[in-house]
């Protein structure tokens, strides 16, 4: 079909449509008309756009041109940043994609000039007069959903007539935007007008299912039902789906409805919208959002364990003070010449059966958030060091006033009994930031790295993840905790909660993927209180950044509900944020402020052997090491592992300003 | 090269018609638009029609309106101008005229490729 | 119709001198201009098009600039092959284009 008929044409995709308009406009009235249909000049900022304008425009003839929404003010030449100074109609600059027909060459820019594409060829970009009626202009226009081209059916008198809210016709949609209306005309007479729009369960699709015109009934293939046919009264026929799916759009095929993953922990189909999320033994569903899941926690329990509690994602775990030891019932503690132990109360172990251990436990491991509590009317006792296990540097509190930690002995337990061995990670804080986040990106199965099952004592501080604190991106920045890590922290406890699973590989069900499981909330500072820092060990330092996502804290946080600790003196060296790379970068981690990745223990591309960190035990030589992505160069090198989860509106490659930098528009521009 | 080769002069009754060729070489005719302009004696230039031999579109000027046609041979690369019923003003001569699609990266609509022109007399 | 008005429509310099040419526009025509040079029984030659750009070939003593309403077209010093008409054309409302009356260069 030539483009240039007298007719329109577009090109639509899931979330927005390109339209082809043949008429001779200056640059202003081309806006004008795409905004009066409700969208605006095309503004094809990535490869894939531009695709899929070429595809639109086609083999145009040479000499046609057609505005697209690129206009720069006079004077405002900026040769060296890919759009030379031009803004977009949309008010901003940033782009992933040019096409410029030549080299910026120097100039003064004297005049405002607009941006037109040419029809032929390449499809190239070239700058000219605003007031210069060219041949066409290209409109985009955005929308919340669109609807697959309907199926043609055996009945039909012809193909389907599509009708956009944006008054293109045509019959050759494959996607059409919400509020488009098709019109199928049947062979028997009748036709039927259906419309796109918004389904309860959420999402659009057809206002009706099909089949749409009488035809032989549900022979010869099933009525083109994937399921079942179902011939009506009046010859209609009709599709229904088996007990655990649901009718598509297409009002054909069926679909599961928890195949999207739509529930953070389990689906169950069935239910009002198709389907119901279900929570492991251990969490609850989030009040704010059904589909997601907090963990409860069992320590704010009164008498849930006789002295010391530590609550973790799915599960807790009773502790006694030196001197004492855990009871059978995991609950109780007794005086004992033995030093202390631990009884494990994950809540998923005693439920499971073998075929169900890999489903359901230790993702929460990953993004451990737990915290200490201490049952009321425990002293804290003088710690206990293992030879092997000397505390290189520990936090400082005034006087005589200081509260000791007790770092007891492992004891090891058989693995059935006691599937975890506790493990901290070296940041204590002794006030959690609050967290008002009520929405952490989940990701599919797929993206989740596994986690390495070992048994093992605890590990020497050479061999430790570094913790990097969570920021939480719908905190207004003056709020958010700072953020710091070290390279080398400091030596832990013996006694901690595990990052490592000792029982149950991780292989998570299509219907689960929690990456970033909520974490219950104590303390109302926003301030992450570190160990001090020995002169030697340079920090690592994380980009903050306004779309980055929520890193799951993987400390435990020690909380008395006996005596608030008091906070560590100023002698330890402040947190430090950062926006853009640190000057030395030895042991930093650079990351694009919009793809910084959680700080989770993941599987990451092998890279220089020194400064890694790792928890495991250097006794399991066969075992995986997580490594931290070290930014040694300008460029990030963390793209080939970021989560499907990372924000659309990351910065491009070619580094224009970011979307929200948006510039305010007014008719005297145009 | 690109070279716009007009036919030669013309004189005619007034009444009469007259068509005038255009022959372009050098380049590809479907992919650029040919302009004819008037020039009479002392006059300043005058803007008549266009041709997008592409697509055979066409746009006249109004004043010409009527009497007019402009049409191409694509394969013979060859514009034609014909103007019917001819008085006395249509002395002059007539520019067929290339109009440039881009230079250097700019759009723009200027005749970057003249004809050497034809002059027309209209006497009785 | 959108009219060019230009001054002066004649102009008499001398070799070496500095010339410019104004070109007025009923109304707003953006940069849509372009200027031609045209020499007796010749057909005119492209100089400068959108406003201010240097057509391929033409010597750099040949300068365009203004947007809106007013242009000028600058010839640096003069060479004797420069004595000619000059014409500014818009083309904003384009394919309507129209043509300034002329401005002849002669020699002093």
């Known amino acids: 079909q030539d483009p240039w008929a007298a007719e329109p044409r577009s090109a639509c995709g899931p979330s927005s449509c390109y339209a082809l308009f043949p008429r001779r406009r200056t640059f202003l009235e081309a806006w004008r008309a795409c905004r009066e249909l409700g969208g605006d000049l095309a503004t094809p900022r990535t490869p894939e756009e531009a695709q899929r304008v070429d595809n639109l425009v086609g083999a145009g003839p040479a000499s046609r041109l057609l505005w697209i929404g690129l206009q720069r003010q006079a004077r405002q030449c900026q040769l060296q940043r890919p759009l030379r100074g031009f803004t977009w109609t949309t008010g901003d600059q940033d782009t992933a994609f040019t096409n410029w027909a030549q080299p910026a060459t120097g100039g003064p820019c004297p005049a405002q000039r607009c941006v037109a594409l040419e029809a032929s060829g390449e499809h190239r970009w070239l700058e000219g007069s605003c007031t210069l009626a060219v041949d066409g202009y290209l409109c985009q226009f955005g929308f919340e959903g669109a609807c697959p081209a309907l199926q043609d059916e055996a009945g039909q008198a012809g193909p389907a007539v599509y009708t956009t809210p944006f008054h293109l016709v045509s019959t050759e949609f494959e996607w059409l935007p919400f509020g488009s209306v098709a019109a199928v005309q049947c062979q028997a007479g009748r036709g039927a007008s259906l419309l796109c729009v918004k389904q309860p369960e959420g999402g659009v699709g057809w206002s009706r299912a099909g089949p749409l015109c009488l035809g032989a009934g549900c022979s010869p293939d099933n009525g083109g039902c994937e399921h079942e046919c179902v011939e009506e009264v009046d010859g209609h026929v009709s599709c229904r789906c088996t007990e655990g799916f649901r009718l598509a759009a297409d009002g054909r095929s069926c679909e599961d409805p928890c195949a999207q993953a739509p529930c953070e922990q389990q689906c169950e189909p069935g239910g009002p919208q198709g389907y119901s999320c279900h929570c492991r033994l251990g969490f609850r569903p989030a009040e704010d959002d059904p589909h997601r899941c907090v963990d409860t926690d069992e320590c704010q329990i009164a008498g849930v364990c006789q002295q010391m509690c530590v609550n973790y994602v799915g599960g807790f775990e009773c502790y006694c003070s030196e001197g004492h030891e855990l009871e059978a019932d995991g609950i109780s503690c007794s005086p004992a010449g033995a030093m202390g132990a631990r009884a494990s109360q994950d809540l998923g172990d005693e439920l499971l059966d073998d075929g169900e251990d890999e489903e359901d436990e230790d993702e929460a491991w990953e993004a451990f958030g737990g915290g200490w509590t201490e049952m009321p009317g425990i002293l804290w006792m003088e710690p206990t060091q293992p030879p092997d296990f000397a505390l290189a540097y520990r936090p400082s509190f005034p006087e005589d006033r200081e509260p000791q930690i007790p770092y007891p002995e492992p004891t090891w337990p058989p693995p059935l009994s006691a599937p975890r061995v506790p493990y901290h990670s070296s940041v204590l804080s002794v006030t959690r930031p609050v967290v008002v986040s009520a929405t952490r990106p989940t990701l599919p199965s797929a993206h989740q790295p596994p986690v390495i099952p070992a048994t093992h004592p605890a590990l020497s501080r050479d061999h430790q993840i570094p913790v990097i604190a969570a920021n939480y991106p719908d905190l207004p920045s003056a709020y958010q905790p700072g953020i710091l890590s070290v390279s080398h922290p400091a030596q832990p406890p013996a006694h901690q909660p595990p990052m490592i699973s000792t029982r149950y590989p991780e292989l998570f069900p299509a219907h689960q993927s929690p990456m970033f499981p909520d974490t219950q909330v104590a303390g109302t500072q926003t301030t992450t209180h570190l160990p001090a820092i020995p002169p030697n060990r340079a920090p690592l330092v994380t980009t903050l950044g306004a779309h980055q996502p929520p890193q799951a804290p993987d400390a435990p946080v020690l909380r008395t509900q006996a005596t608030q600790l008091p906070i560590i003196p100023t002698a330890q060296p402040s947190l430090t944020t950062s926006s853009r790379s640190p000057v030395s970068p030895a042991h930093q981690v650079s990351v694009p402020a919009a793809t910084q990745p959680p700080a989770l223990p993941t599987l990451l591309p092998s890279q220089s052997p020194t400064n890694q960190t790792s928890p495991i035990s250097p006794t399991h030589p066969h075992s995986k090491v997580p490594q931290i992505p070290r930014e040694d160069g300008p460029s990030p090198k963390l793209a080939l592992w970021l989560p499907s989860a990372a924000p659309t509106a990351a910065p491009t490659a070619l580094g224009e300003a970011s979307l929200a930098e948006h510039i305010q528009r007014d008719d005297r521009w145009l | 090269q690109v070279q716009l080769v007009q036919s030669g002069p013309e004189v005619k009754k007034p009444g009469a018609s007259v068509k005038l060729s255009c022959k372009a070489s050098?380049?590809?005719?479907?992919?650029?638009?040919i302009h004819w302009v008037k020039q009479a004696p002392g006059q300043r230039l005058e803007w008549m029609g266009y041709?997008?031999?592409?697509?055979?579109?066409?746009t006249y000027n109004q004043k010409f309106k009527g009497r007019v046609t402009i049409t191409v041979d694509t394969s013979a690369s060859t514009a034609y101008m014909e103007l019917n019923s001819l008085r006395s003003e249509d002395t002059a001569v007539y520019y067929c005229a290339r109009r440039g699609n881009s230079y250097d990266g700019y759009f723009d609509y200027s005749m970057d490729y003249w004809g050497q022109g034809t002059l027309v007399t209209v006497s009785s | 119709d959108i009219q060019l008005t230009q001054s002066p429509s004649f102009l008499s310099a001398s070799v070496g001198d500095r010339v410019t040419i104004t070109c007025r526009a009923s109304q707003n025509v953006g940069t849509a201009v372009a200027w031609y040079q045209q020499k007796p029984g010749k057909a005119p030659k492209l100089l400068i098009y959108s406003a201010s750009n240097r057509y391929t070939g033409v010597p750099s003593r040949f300068s365009g600039s203004g947007s809106g309403t007013e242009f000028t077209l600058t010839i640096s010093s003069l060479q004797p092959e420069d004595f000619a008409t000059y014409y500014c054309?818009?083309?904003?409302?384009?394919?309507?284009?129209?043509f300034g009356q002329g401005t002849k260069l002669e020699i002093k």
């Open positions: 041709i997008n031999p592409y697509d055979d579109d066409t």
């Open positions: 050098g380049y590809t005719f479907t992919d650029y638009v």
């Open positions: 054309q818009q083309y904003t409302n384009y394919p309507m284009y129209t």
